[in-house]
């Protein structure tokens, strides 16, 4: 057991150009937290992965306010260590993510929010028990610097803090075998009671009652050395003497997965298959419950009353992720129908919609026509959010109020002259041309292509449109 | 600023189920979660449920088995239904509009009464 | 479910003095999610604070609210008559949402 220990030493802009804007403004005050989050070994998993080593999350640093004009400086940070202790040993490597918190402070939606501000994440061999070790690391345009360290809890002590500690027995020295607990010389290495029998050269053990086998090494008592002559089977019958695998207990023997977890033998060693809630080597580490405020923004933790029964979180509007974290741009998600423009205005959400529709999100479409005439005569029709009149002859616009100039539109084909008249449009065709619009040639020979033409009028003559 | 008025029955039998209406004076209802909560004469208040217009909800797990939360946009109302009702459930109901920073409860209705009797 | 308590149970005072309500939760109200209403007779509650410590719109700055984990604390100023009414916390850190019994607040 131990603690791994993380200082932060400062936050802010990195060099070169292209300085961050501060986090925090007059009308916007700030407060930066951090969150660390440890995994074991050279993971390289998503920020989302559980925290199988453990999580920690730092108070709230000092409140801040830009100084108008003034770059963004190293930012205030909140007193103390992180601490993220481990229960079993330490692995020696592992990966953490560091993620720099902002709690904004103004009022403008009633209360505090908070954003993640950079996130920062790597892998690294570590000693416990050795000194700080210093880091920085960018990401974007700020750069945090921090060190870390991990260290056991006594009794634990050495790199993995595995070794047990115990008061010397004697005032001088150590019992028969036994070495001093460096760095606490007043103390002396106390023997873990292995397994009975557990070879002392070739064995070790990391729990008490249990016999592991270094390398090239097998059996119970790990007394047999691992030949690579041939055997009936890879753990088939044998002897000591043959120097094959006997059929001793396999790593998954008395179930090394705590917390109901399934064992699987792999190559090396072991893998767990861990029940919902808990994590790590054995399944010993515990996920996150609704006890440890996951929810951020005013999120609501439901379930998760049990390290066994995962957590979600209810995000009030406006926020969204596994914890509320992130910000959402509603607009984005084009709630507005019928062409109604979006306002997110933080604590709500509202639509303006266009002339002929309603609701929340303009999905209800109005009776166009209610209550709406045209004039001169004019037919409402009802379509796309407004109404529409459809005017009688001689009349336009949108209500049918203006008189219409029939001969705007170049209705006589073939250069036919246009003429307005009190009901309609005449027109007068060119040579060679007849009909309403002008449309039909006149055949050579004087015959049209249409019926012969009405008593009084000439081809050519101007043809009345009625 | 928006109003909230509770409706329904004022009495209700015995193993009979309670219904009631609450009507939101605006078009907000889509922006907000909406809640429900009772409180019995001279007691304290209890949350029931709430409600979101995407479909999620929550409920009270002692009630939850007896209740149903649901909501209309098209009319701006939710609602609530308490099945089986006993002499116990008789309390003032509120529906209220859920705080759009975190689940306290910014704006009330009145309150109906509801008596259980047969 | 987080049990409040709230204490006294209730708190004879004279206008103008200072009242001093509490709410203890059975486990820790995470990120200082909580609540506080007034209640007048024969009325709907009032929202006066919310994250423990934030005074809700057009709520008198008479009305204080502090504390943090389980401890929290509802601090009326300088009480004016029309503060003599029951007040109630509540949690919303984790659900269910509960609320604490009340704390009646009358003239002595």
């Known amino acids: 057991a131990g603690v791994f220990e993380l200082q932060i030493h400062s936050f802010g802009p990195g060099p070169g150009p292209g300085a961050p804007r501060s986090p925090c403004s007059a009308r916007l005050p700030c407060r930066l937290f951090f969150r660390v989050c440890l995994k074991p070994g050279l993971s390289e998993e998503a920020a989302e992965s559980p925290c199988a080593l453990g999580a920690a999350l730092s108070a709230r640093g000092p409140v801040y306010t830009e100084q108008p004009g003034a770059p963004a400086p190293d930012l205030p940070l909140p007193d103390g260590l992180l601490q993220v202790p481990f229960r079993d040993a330490w692995p020696g490597t592992f990966s953490f993510i560091i993620e720099t918190w902002r709690e904004e402070l103004g009022d403008q939606i009633g209360g505090p929010a908070w954003s993640l501000l950079a996130r920062v994440a790597g892998r690294r061999r570590l000693a416990a028990g050795g000194p700080w070790a210093r880091d920085i690391q960018r990401a974007g345009a700020w750069e945090l610097r921090f060190s870390y360290r991990a260290r056991c809890e006594p009794p634990a002590v050495g790199t993995a803090c595995t070794r047990l500690c115990r008061p010397r027995s004697a005032p001088s020295r150590c019992g028969p075998g036994l070495r001093p607990c460096a760095p606490l010389e007043d103390e002396c290495e106390a023997p873990l009671v292995c397994r009975a029998g557990c070879s002392p050269e070739h064995g070790f053990c990391e729990q008490p009652g249990e016999c592991r086998c270094l390398e090239g090494w097998t059996g119970p008592l790990c007394t047999v050395p691992v030949s690579t002559s041939s055997c009936l089977s890879p753990r088939g019958p044998s002897s000591a003497t043959t120097g094959c695998l006997v059929p001793g207990p396999g790593p998954c023997d008395g179930n090394p997965c705590a917390n109901g977890g399934s064992c699987s033998e792999t190559p090396r060693s072991f893998e767990c298959t861990c029940p919902r809630g808990f994590y790590g080597l054995r399944c010993e580490v515990s996920g996150v419950t609704c006890a440890d405020g996951p929810c951020f923004n005013g999120g609501l933790c439901v379930g998760g009353a049990d390290p066994d029964s995962a957590y979600i979180c209810h995000c009030p509007p406006g926020f969204q992720g596994s914890n509320c974290e992130k910000r959402v741009d509603r607009c984005s998600l084009q709630p507005c129908r019928n062409g109604g423009l979006c306002l997110d205005l933080g604590h709500a959400l509202r639509c303006r919609c266009r002339a002929g529709f309603a609701g929340p999100r303009c999905e209800h479409d109005l009776d166009d026509c209610a209550g709406r005439a045209c004039a001169n005569g004019g037919t409402c029709v009802e379509g796309g959010g407004a109404h529409r009149c459809s005017c009688a002859l001689g009349f336009g616009g949108r209500d049918c109020r203006e008189r219409a100039d029939p001969c705007a539109a170049r209705p006589c084909a073939h250069g036919g002259r246009c003429y307005a008249h009190f009901s309609g449009l005449v027109c007068a065709c060119a040579p060679g041309y007849m009909g309403a619009r002008c449309e039909f040639p006149v055949h050579p020979d004087g015959a049209s292509a249409l019926p012969a033409a009405p008593p009084g009028l000439r081809p050519g003559d101007p043809q009345r449109y009625l | 600023q928006v109003q909230l008025q509770e409706s329904g029955p004022g009495l209700v039998k015995p193993s009979e189920t309670l219904s009631l209406t609450c009507t939101v004076s605006?078009?907000?209802?889509?922006?907000?979660?909406w809640s429900w909560i009772r409180q019995p004469p001279g007691k304290g208040l209890e949350w029931i449920a709430y409600i979101y217009y995407s479909g999620t909800t929550n409920y009270n797990p002692s009630l939850k088995s007896r209740v149903t939360i649901s909501l209309d946009t098209s009319k701006n109302q939710f609602s609530l239904q308490l099945s089986s009702v006993t002499a116990a459930d008789a309390a003032v109901y509120y529906c209220?509009?859920?705080?759009?920073?975190?689940?306290?409860?910014?704006?009330w209705g009145q309150g109906t009464m509801v008596t259980v009797s047969s | 479910e987080i049990v409040l308590t709230q204490s006294p149970g209730t708190l004879s005072l004279s206008p103008g003095e200072r009242a001093t309500l509490s709410c203890r939760a059975s486990q820790r109200v995470s990120n200082t999610y909580l609540a506080w209403y007034q209640q007048n007779p024969g009325q709907a509650p009032r929202l006066l604070i919310y994250?423990?410590?934030s005074r809700a719109t057009g709520i008198p700055d008479r009305f204080s609210g502090s504390g943090s984990g389980t401890d929290f604390t509802l601090t009326i100023s300088r009480l004016e008559p029309e503060d003599f009414a029951v007040y109630y916390c509540q949690q919303y850190g984790t659900s269910p949402l509960t609320f604490g019994g009340g704390t009646k607040v009358e003239i002595k």
């Open positions: 209220a509009r859920v705080f759009h920073w975190g689940f306290a409860f910014d704006i």
């Open positions: 994250g423990a410590s």
């Open positions: 605006d078009n907000s209802i889509s922006n907000y979660y």
